[in-house]
Amino acid sequence: SGRGEAETRECIYYNANWELERTNQSGLERCEGEQDKRLHCYASWRNSSGTIELVKKGCWLDDFNCYDRQECVATEENPQVYFCCCEGNFCNERFTHLPEAGGPEVTYEPPPTAPT
């Protein structure tokens, strides 16, 4: 696309509410976009007393808040639902909370895939 940013064509997909919403629970999502618009991946999660509950992952539309972010980093201090977005294929596999006000960085790794 000539602007130097990482192109996003596929993201990790996840929906914790998949049964009610009748979607897939997890997988890969191919991102479809309009010409001249950037695409991103996102992750959203809750943190209940240190226990991470993944909410959703997938593709995200052109959003200046996500530009040139190779890693998915949430910066809000203590939201009900954390959100991060990034550019580059599958960049939402790992996600991090790094509050702007300072404090410890917490990175969440996906669980290892069981061998088939």
Epitope: E34, L61, Q80, V81, Y82
Partner: antibody, heavy 119, light 107 residues
Framework: EVQLLESGGGLVQPGGSLRLYCAAS????????MSWVRQAPGKGLEWVSA????????YYADSVKGRFTISRDNSKNTLYLQMNSLRAEDTAVYYC????????????WGQGTLVTVSS | DIQMTQSPSSLSASVGDRVTITCRAS??????LNWYQQKPGKAPKLLIY???VLQSGVPSRFSGSGSGTDFTLTISSLQPEDFATYYC?????????FGGGTKVEIK
């Protein structure tokens, strides 16, 4: 230019059926999820139903579940809403709208078609 | 379902005024919040998505902010063409819900 054109609205008696159509042009129809949203006279917007780009996944508001069926024909660039067991409270302007990738917003809307349920 | 509550339901303002509309979700919806404008007899038009991202062609006097459950649409200097009804909508759940709308009228 993206265009969505609804048709099929009209006057129907309570308990009757109606099929709405939304003809799409100006974009790759099968790449987009599509929704129906309605607006009763003088009231706000109410989301009714949605369907994935492939047509495999469908979603319904509780108020229409079991009575309305959303479907699409990507070869004809057309979205449908089959409405059965219609009630007076279904009277509204029905809009079709496109959605790129959930959780994207509804970025283009048709001009709407009026459905009136009355005896 | 996620309930969306908008306030006020209507307001009167003059050209040049700063106008603020609020939207509250019944549960945390992160950044999955969109705003629409509707004029009488017309289809809704997308203004803002992802809380704060202006849709192409929308004037910069419109802005959005907030997170979690509380969100705001601001018009920094109201123009004659801005008199309309504004709706918030959540896309956190595939079962979309809209706020009840805020009608912006001429004072």
């Amino acid at each position: 230019e993206v265009q969505l054109l609804e048709s099929g609205g009209g006057l129907v008696q309570p308990g009757g059926s109606l099929r709405l159509y939304c003809a799409a042009s100006g974009f790759t129809f099968g790449a987009y999820a599509m929704s129906w949203v309605r607006q009763a006279p003088g009231k706000g917007l109410e989301w009714v139903s949605a369907i994935s780009g492939s047509g495999d996944d469908t979603y319904y508001a509780d108020s229409v579940k079991g009575r309305f069926t959303i479907s699409r024909d990507n070869s004809k660039n057309t979205l449908y809403l089959q409405m059965n067991s219609l009630r007076a409270e279904d009277t509204a302007v029905y809009y079709c709208a496109r959605q790129l990738i959930p959780p994207a917003p509804l970025d283009y809307w048709g001009q709407g078609t009026l459905v009136t349920v009355s005896s | 379902d996620i309930q969306m509550t908008q306030s006020p339901s209507s307001l009167s303002a003059s050209v040049g005024d700063r106008v603020t509309i609020t939207c509250r979700a019944s549960q945390g919806i992160s950044r999955f919040l969109n705003w629409y404008q509707q004029k009488p007899g017309k289809a809704p038009k997308l203004l803002i998505y992802g809380v704060s991202v202006l849709q192409s062609g929308v004037p910069s006097r419109f802005s959005g902010s907030g997170s979690g459950t509380d969100f705001t649409l601001t018009i920094s200097s109201l123009q004659p063409e801005d008199f309309a009804t504004y709706y918030c909508q959540q896309s956190f759940s595939s079962l979309f819900t809209f706020g009840g709308g805020t009608k912006v009228e001429i004072k």
